[in-house]
Structures are given as structure tokens and as C-alpha cells.
């Protein structure tokens, strides 16, 4: 069971300081942006981190949404990352959900975060380069200190 606590507005960056945004095709991508670019591209660069408490002691659970014309929420259905047109619900009556990720500090790097899928244990949100695009993907954690699964989350209060 996941019960919603509240939400905050955030800018998410990879460790190369590229900013996560949702493009016109609803794809989550990373791109180099100045602070001015970041503001100019809002709301596509502003993510709503919806915080949930897990009924099992597994930590801070989050759903990540973006509001452009409508609200879309990040999903990892079938281990494929996509944004689905939906509002994060108040309650999720299950122990797993394709839209719920566990947000934790990276040990030894307190300002860095990682997001583990609640549906696929051991799989994390990651940044991966594919041709000329830096994409948000779901990746099985296979090594310690993998920078591709680490992110910074900046409050936009």
C-alpha cells in the first residue's frame, strides 16, 4: 500500500549537469541547459515529485509527473520508461506499481539521489546515451558507483 504524502516541484539533473525534460514527443531526455534555458523550457523541465509512504518499511516512494497541457506520470511498465497521461493517485493498494520509485540518498554522496523501481527490484532510473540523445531509461544496477543512476534534485519552491 502506498499513501500519498505531498508533492514538490523539482528540476532533475544527471551527474553531467544535464537537465531532464520532456520533449514534444513526450520522451524524457537530458540536455545541456543554462538556468535561463531551464526557465524558458518550463514546464517541460519542472517535475512534480509526488511523495508516498510505503506500508512496508522500504522508504520514501515517489511518482514523477509533469504538467504540460495535461498531467503525465512516469511509468516503467515492462521495464520501458514512458510518460502516461494520468494523475498520481492518492492511494495505491498494492506493494508494487509501475509509477512508484524508491528515492534514496546515494551512500557517501548525500546530495545525490537514486530511484529504484518498486515493480522491478534492482532496476533504477538511469541516463543512457543513444546516438545523439541522452535518454532516461530503466537499468539493472550492475556495479557499485554507477554514475548513470545518480541524479541531483533541485527544489523549485
Amino acid at each position: 500500500y502506498f499513501g500519498k504524502l505531498e508533492s514538490k516541484l523539482s528540476i532533475i539533473r544527471n551527474l553531467n549537469d544535464q537537465v531532464l525534460f520532456i520533449d514534444q514527443g513526450n520522451r524524457p531526455l537530458f540536455e545541456d541547459m543554462t538556468d535561463s534555458d531551464c526557465r524558458d523550457n518550463a514546464p517541460r523541465t519542472i517535475f512534480i515529485i509526488n511523495m508516498y509512504k510505503d506500508s512496508q518499511p522500504r522508504g520514501m516512494a515517489v511518482a514523477i509527473s509533469v504538467k504540460c497541457e495535461k498531467i503525465s506520470t512516469l511509468s516503467c511498465e515492462n521495464r520501458i520508461i514512458s510518460f502516461k497521461e494520468m494523475n498520481p493517485p492518492d492511494n495505491i493498494k498494492d506493494t508494487k506499481s509501475d509509477i512508484i520509485f524508491f528515492q534514496r540518498s546515494v551512500p557517501g554522496h548525500d546530495n545525490k539521489m537514486q530511484f529504484e523501481s518498486s515493480s522491478y527490484e534492482g532496476y533504477f532510473l538511469a541516463c543512457e546515451k543513444e546516438r545523439d540523445l541522452y535518454k532516461l531509461i530503466l537499468k539493472k544496477k550492475d556495479e557499485l558507483g554507477d554514475r548513470s543512476i545518480m541524479f541531483t534534485v533541485q527544489n523549485e519552491d
Epitope: 500500500y1 502506498f2 499513501g3 500519498k4 504524502l5 505531498e6 508533492s7 514538490k8 516541484l9 515529485i49 511523495m51 508516498y52 509512504k53 510505503d54 506500508s55 518499511p57 522500504r58 522508504g59 520514501m60 492518492d90 492511494n91 493498494k93 528515492q103 534514496r104 540518498s105 551512500p107 548525500d110 546530495n111 539521489m113 527544489n155 519552491d157
Partner: antibody
């Protein structure tokens, strides 16, 4: 202006029951988890119980698990704490609170507290 | 769940700096950046000083700062003033079956 106003405190005998209420105004109550926090005379703060936005998720400190029940009515902007099988060690000022979680956007709101005294 | 561990008391003279520690575990302080600090004067409700480890709400003096290393969070107060004399509590989100946990509290005396 944000306000949280607690009511329902008072004197109760050990083993008795009491229900606290907290009426919220000045913010969108239904968008936030809420908590009860208590402070025994001369002691520190103790988080007691919390509830999710929709009321489906309820969370308790080990010291009150099974005796206290938290609930909310979003249509009335009201938070409740039903306290059963009260003990002397439950004597405290009970604060209704929306503690910090995601920071300044949502704020950090506390009532002024209501005193619950458990004594024969 | 156990309370987070703080020193029972600290003291300092006006103008000095003091630091209050708050030690937890990887299930609370160490695992999340959701650590906050409160100031409480006698008979008053707690007042938020720091949220998410190091962020100050508007209206809070920049003399108050927060940090975290591993399972220990710290509150530093610089340029101590008489009105800083109060009780200070840390708090953290916890992955246990509860939701939050508070620290044991620290009484600050300004000499």
C-alpha cells in the same frame, strides 16, 4: 493565514478514551499528509501518528500502535486522533501538525497544542 | 523506532558558533535528505529552522545552517544571540513502519 486549531483535550482516567480534533484553514488541507506530535511535560517532541492525503495510509509510533487511530475528513478540513486504553505516560500536549516534508512550498504548520492529562 | 540521538545540552557565548549533532541510521537520516531542524521556546509550538538537510525557510536567519554526513546531521548556529537560547530538535523521514522520528532534543544555553 494558516491555522490549525486542536480541541478535545482534558483530564481522563487510565484505561479511558478521548478523541482529539484539529480544524485546518488557510491551506489546501486535502493536499497534505498530516501528523499528531506530542510532548510530555518537560520532555522532548515525539511523533505519534500520521495519515496520507486520502486517508488510506495511516502510520503510528510503536508506543501507540493498536491503541490510537488517526483519521481525517477532507470535506470538513479536520484531522482526528482517537485515543483508547490511555496510560499515564500518554499525558502530554498534543500538537496537530503538517510537519515539513517538501519544504517551503508547502510550509510547516503547527497548532498551539491541547493538553491531555491521564490520571486517576 | 528509536529517537535520533542529540547531545542533551550545548552552550556558547554571544557571538560564538555552536554545532548540534543528530545521529540516526541508514533507515532515517542516512537514507534520505528529509532531515529538518526545529527551535522551541518554552510554552511555544516548534518553529522550523531547516528543511531537507540544509534549506532555510524564508524568514529564518542565515545564522542557522544545516548539513549531513552519512547517518549524522548537524545544525550550526553562528553569531550566537541571547534569543537563540531554546530547545532544538532534529527530525527525519523514516523508512520504518512509522513516518517521522524526532531527535532527543538539545538545550542551548547562551552564556
Amino acid at each position: 493565514e494558516v491555522q490549525l486549531v486542536e480541541s478535545g483535550g482534558g483530564l481522563v482516567q487510565p484505561g479511558g478514551s478521548m478523541r482529539l480534533s484539529c480544524t485546518a484553514s488557510g491551506f489546501t488541507f486535502s493536499e497534505y499528509a498530516m501528523s499528531w506530535v506530542r510532548q510530555a511535560p518537560g520532555k522532548g517532541l515525539e511523533w505519534v501518528s500520521g495519515i496520507s492525503t486520502g486517508g488510506g495510509g495511516t502510520y503510528y509510533a510503536d508506543s501507540v500502535e493498536g491503541r490510537f487511530t488517526i483519521s481525517r475528513d477532507n470535506s470538513k478540513n479536520t484531522l482526528y486522533l482517537q485515543m483508547n486504553s490511555l496510560r499515564a505516560e500518554d499525558t502530554a500536549v498534543y500538537y496537530c501538525a503538517k510537519p515539513w516534508l517538501s519544504g517551503s512550498r508547502s510550509g510547516d504548520f503547527w497548532g498551539q497544542g491541547t493538553l491531555v492529562t491521564v490520571s486517576s | 523506532q528509536s529517537a535520533l540521538t542529540q547531545p542533551a545540552s550545548v552552550s556558547g557565548s554571544p557571538g560564538q558558533s555552536i554545532t548540534i549533532s543528530c545521529t540516526g541510521t541508514s533507515s532515517d537520516v542516512g537514507g534520505y535528505n528529509y532531515v529538518s531542524w526545529y527551535q522551541q521556546h518554552p510554552g511555544k509550538a516548534p518553529k522550523l529552522l531547516i528543511y531537507e538537510v540544509s534549506h532555510r525557510p524564508s524568514g529564518v536567519s542565515d545564522r542557522f545552517s544545516g548539513s549531513k554526513s552519512g547517518n549524522t546531521a548537524s545544525l550550526t548556529i553562528s553569531g550566537l544571540q541571547a534569543e537563540d537560547e531554546a530547545d532544538y530538535y532534529c527530525s527525519s523521514f523514516t523508512s520504518s513502519s512509522s513516518l517521522y522520528v524526532f531527535g532527543t532534543g538539545t538545550k542551548l544555553t547562551v552564556l
